[in-house]
């Protein structure tokens, strides 16, 4: 056969799988002789043991026989199967040859494995002997497990293959093998050709792109040729029949299987993989040995073969960068007007939805960030007491507040409401004061003097004061936020000099002080300053952090206090506080 390599003719420059604008387009591997250089398994080869064979020639009416020896052990006299698929030089023909006179019902088979699916255009055999009287070509699409007929040749189709002679091919039966008597002449006695064209006479051949039936019909992983009956001159049963019988055998100089590596229009070449198997070098986001499926995460539309008009590339699922996996749902694809059928799986970053395109319950969209951002969804942080639920408005982040509660996270009482001790109704209406008494506002108390003594900031620290309090800590005020009836200070606890039953840890914590205490400057506290805080254990609104009130001591920090406080700490450990 012609020595075309599988990989020959690959142009280096333009990409066959995309156009000049970079858009995908159909691409197909080069047309090759898929049989070239491949091993052919044969059921019979002459020469083991060495045997005589005779070649018949004709001169006018006269029949001449020249006899030779076939010897498999002598390279000069051997006719091995390798000669079927070697370089076919018409000036130096090499022929595979079967044993003599394997006549019907015995047959001789040639089996060629292509190693992968090919789209076969033709199967041809060039003979050194006369062509067979009956012969069948079969194909396998499953690597030789099952075989289906491709074509039959016989002068007696019905008798040999139980097939009608030259049955018409219609759209209804175009994927069926037919039987013909063409190419079955005994002459020429040598050099005759049998060529089967897979699409010849098939009605849909002109519209091959749109004919799944014919696409299937031309697909093969293996080809088998079965020689069923030898042509004879009718002298094989005469007295001197041994010479005649030695003249009848099958001999083939060239077996060709013309076609292309099957890649469904999604690859321009086939290559060897790590296992040395032939596979398509898939493009258009496809995968598989025949580019017959979409590669992972490219399931937004169903896999389709490329056509001359449409590349039908696989499309990535749109998961807005929040999912790594998706699956195809045909019904959703159809419902979308055949645009998108990918369903994202396991949306991350607190997103949800078919495309991970909205925030999951308990989160809302940060409109300052694109939906593809890792932090596009922010936690609602609805106040556990003030909010009526954990789900907030997807766009504004507003939590559903209980009666009388306000704020985006429902963390403070609305105007005209005051904090209660009930978690069910955390804010209750401020009772309207009778006309005789002056109504007092929680926000700005009118009589701070009667409420508490504002610290002047020059307080002294002694053992007695240290012992009276449950905890003593050095704090750095970082920021302050209003939270209903409370102020929430974010503080950094630098040192812990005393702690009660609730363990106080160093690091960032919340310090809670009632709004009224702050309004009356008991204690007086400013952000970004460092303080010594002595206070009593009390439950904070968020069940963590510490509480200070009008009875707490908050004194601007002096470094000289560190040693004194360590002393107090040691004394306390020795039980001195109980005496004090």
């Amino acid at each position: 056969g012609p020595g075309l390599s599988m990989f020959a003719g690959q142009a280096a420059q333009p990409d066959p799988c995309s156009d000049e604008n970079g858009h995908p387009r159909r691409c197909i591997p080069d047309f090759v002789n898929a049989a070239f250089g491949k091993d052919v398994r044969v059921s019979s080869t002459c020469g083991r043991p060495p045997a005589r064979y005779c070649v018949v020639s004709e001169r006018g009416e006269e029949r001449l026989r020249s006899c030779h020896l076939c010897n498999a052990s002598d390279p000069k006299k051997a006719h091995p199967p390798a000669f079927l698929t070697d370089l076919n030089n018409p000036h130096n023909l090499t022929c595979w040859q079967s044993e003599n006179y394997l006549q019907f019902p015995h047959n001789v088979t040639l089996t060629l494995s292509l190693g992968k699916k090919f789209e076969v255009t033709y199967v041809s055999l060039q003979f050194c002997s006369p062509r067979p009287e009956s012969m069948a070509i079969y194909k396998s699409m499953d690597y030789g497990r099952t075989w289906v007929p491709f074509q039959f040749y016989s002068t007696q189709c019905r008798k040999m293959y139980n097939r009608p002679h030259r049955a018409p091919i219609t759209k209804q039966n175009e994927q069926e093998a037919v039987c013909t008597d063409s190419h079955t002449d005994m002459r020429p006695l040598s050099g005759g050709l049998i060529a089967f064209s897979t699409l010849d006479g098939r009605p849909s051949a002109h519209d091959f792109d749109n004919s799944p039936v014919l696409q299937d019909w031309v697909t093969a992983t293996d080809i088998r040729v079965a020689f069923s009956r030898l042509h004879t001159f009718g002298d094989e049963n005469e007295d001197d029949s041994e010479l005649a019988r030695d003249s009848y055998f099958y001999a083939v100089s060239d077996l060709q299987v013309g076609g292309r590596c099957k890649c469904n229009g999604h690859a321009a070449r086939c290559v060897r993989d790590r296992d040395d198997s032939l596979v398509c070098d898939c493009r258009h986001n496809t995968a598989g040995p025949e580019c017959d499926r979409c590669k992972p995460f490219h399931y937004d539309r169903p896999w389709q073969r490329a056509t001359a008009r449409e590349a039908n590339e696989c499309v990535a699922c749109n998961c807005n960068l929040h999912a790594r996996r998706c699956r195809f749902n045909m019904e959703l694809y159809k419902l979308s007007g055949r645009k998108s059928g990918g369903v994202c799986l396991n949306c991350r970053h607190n997103t949800a939805g078919r495309h991970c395109h909205y925030c999951k319950e308990g989160y809302y969209r940060d409109m300052g960030k694109p939906i593809t951002h890792r932090k596009a969804c922010k936690a609602c942080d609805c106040h556990p007491v003030g909010a009526a639920g954990k789900t907030c408005n997807q766009t504004t982040g507003q939590c559903p507040c209980k009666d009388g509660v306000t704020g985006i996270t429902c963390n403070r009482c609305a105007k005209g409401y005051q904090q209660s001790r009930s978690p069910i109704a955390p804010c209750i209406k401020i009772p309207v004061a009778p006309p005789t008494t002056a109504a007092s506002s929680v926000e700005e108390p009118e009589d701070c003097d009667s409420y508490c003594k504002a610290s002047k900031g020059k307080l002294k620290i002694n053992m007695k004061k240290y012992c009276k309090k449950d905890y003593a800590v050095q704090i750095h005020i970082l920021k302050a936020d209003k939270a209903g009836d409370w102020w929430k200070f974010t503080v950094n606890i630098i040192s812990v000099y005393k702690q009660g039953t609730s363990r106080i840890r160093r690091g960032d914590q919340s310090l809670w002080i009632r709004s009224r205490d702050i309004a009356c400057k008991c204690p007086k506290i400013k952000p970004l300053k460092k303080y010594l805080l002595l206070g009593n254990a009390e439950d904070s609104p968020d069940q963590s952090g510490i509480v200070a009130d009008k009875s707490s001591l908050v004194i601007q920090w002096r470094d000289t206090w560190a040693r004194r406080l360590r002393k107090f700490q040691q004394r306390e450990k020795k039980g001195k506080c109980k005496k004090a």
Partner: antibody, heavy 109, light 101 residues
């Protein structure tokens, strides 16, 4: 076995809203689309819309857009359909049906 | 919307007959066609999906064929229990549409 159990009022007055429920059992609710189809007396079938309970995606027949709402509750494996602003032409038997390859399973209507 | 036109609108047959119902789509719907049988007071029952696949439990006398725009439901050797309304339906493109039955 697969079952689709429908419930809802037998009769709704014009201009009001029809609310129907379809409770499923026997398969994974989130794996199949749930469709709503109606059939006026003595007439053919008409597709109203569908929901993919896996993520709440809906698709509606344009003819009903704005009047129909289909929802699903994964926790109870139940689909719901509401059709508002009812008129006399909306008189029909309403079915829920499981999607897939054809409507193999239907509610009783 | 894709229109599905069924014919004939009604027909009568004798037990053992072969009956053919056709359905024509207003545009190509590939093989995305299903056939249903409906008896009075009952929900429809799926017979055929993807134009030619018989649904589980449907007797072999029911068969479907067609591709593109022309589809056929054939009932061979018809039985008295087959008296019913028959609908075709396309699910090629939203909105899903049915034949008039």
């Amino acid at each position: 076995q697969v079952q689709l159990q429908q419930s809802g009022p037998g009769l709704v007055k014009p201009s009001q809203t029809l609310s129907l429920t379809c409770a499923i059992s026997g398969y994974t609710f989130t794996s199949y689309n749930m469709h709503w189809i109606r059939q006026p007396p003595g007439k053919g079938l008409e597709w109203i819309g569908a929901i993919y309970p896996g993520n709440g995606d809906t698709s509606y027949n344009q003819k009903f857009k704005g009047r129909v709402t289909i929802t699903a509750d994964k926790s109870t494996s139940t689909a719901y359909m509401e059709l508002s602003s009812l008129r006399s032409e909306d008189t029909a038997v309403y079915y829920c049906a499981r999607g897939g390859t054809g409507f193999a399973y239907w509610g009783q209507g | 919307d894709i229109q599905m036109t069924q014919s004939p609108s009604s027909l009568s047959a004798s037990v053992g007959d072969r009956v053919t119902i056709t359905c024509k789509a207003s545009q190509s719907v590939s093989n995305d066609v299903a056939w249903y049988q409906q008896k009075p007071g009952q929900a429809p029952r799926l017979l055929i999906y993807y134009a030619s696949n018989r649904y589980t439990g449907i007797p072999p006398r029911f068969s479907g064929s067609g591709y593109g725009t022309d589809f056929t439901l054939t009932i061979n050797n018809i039985e008295s229990e087959d008296a019913a309304y028959y609908f075709c339906q396309q699910d090629y493109s939203s909105p899903w549409t049915f034949g008039q039955g």
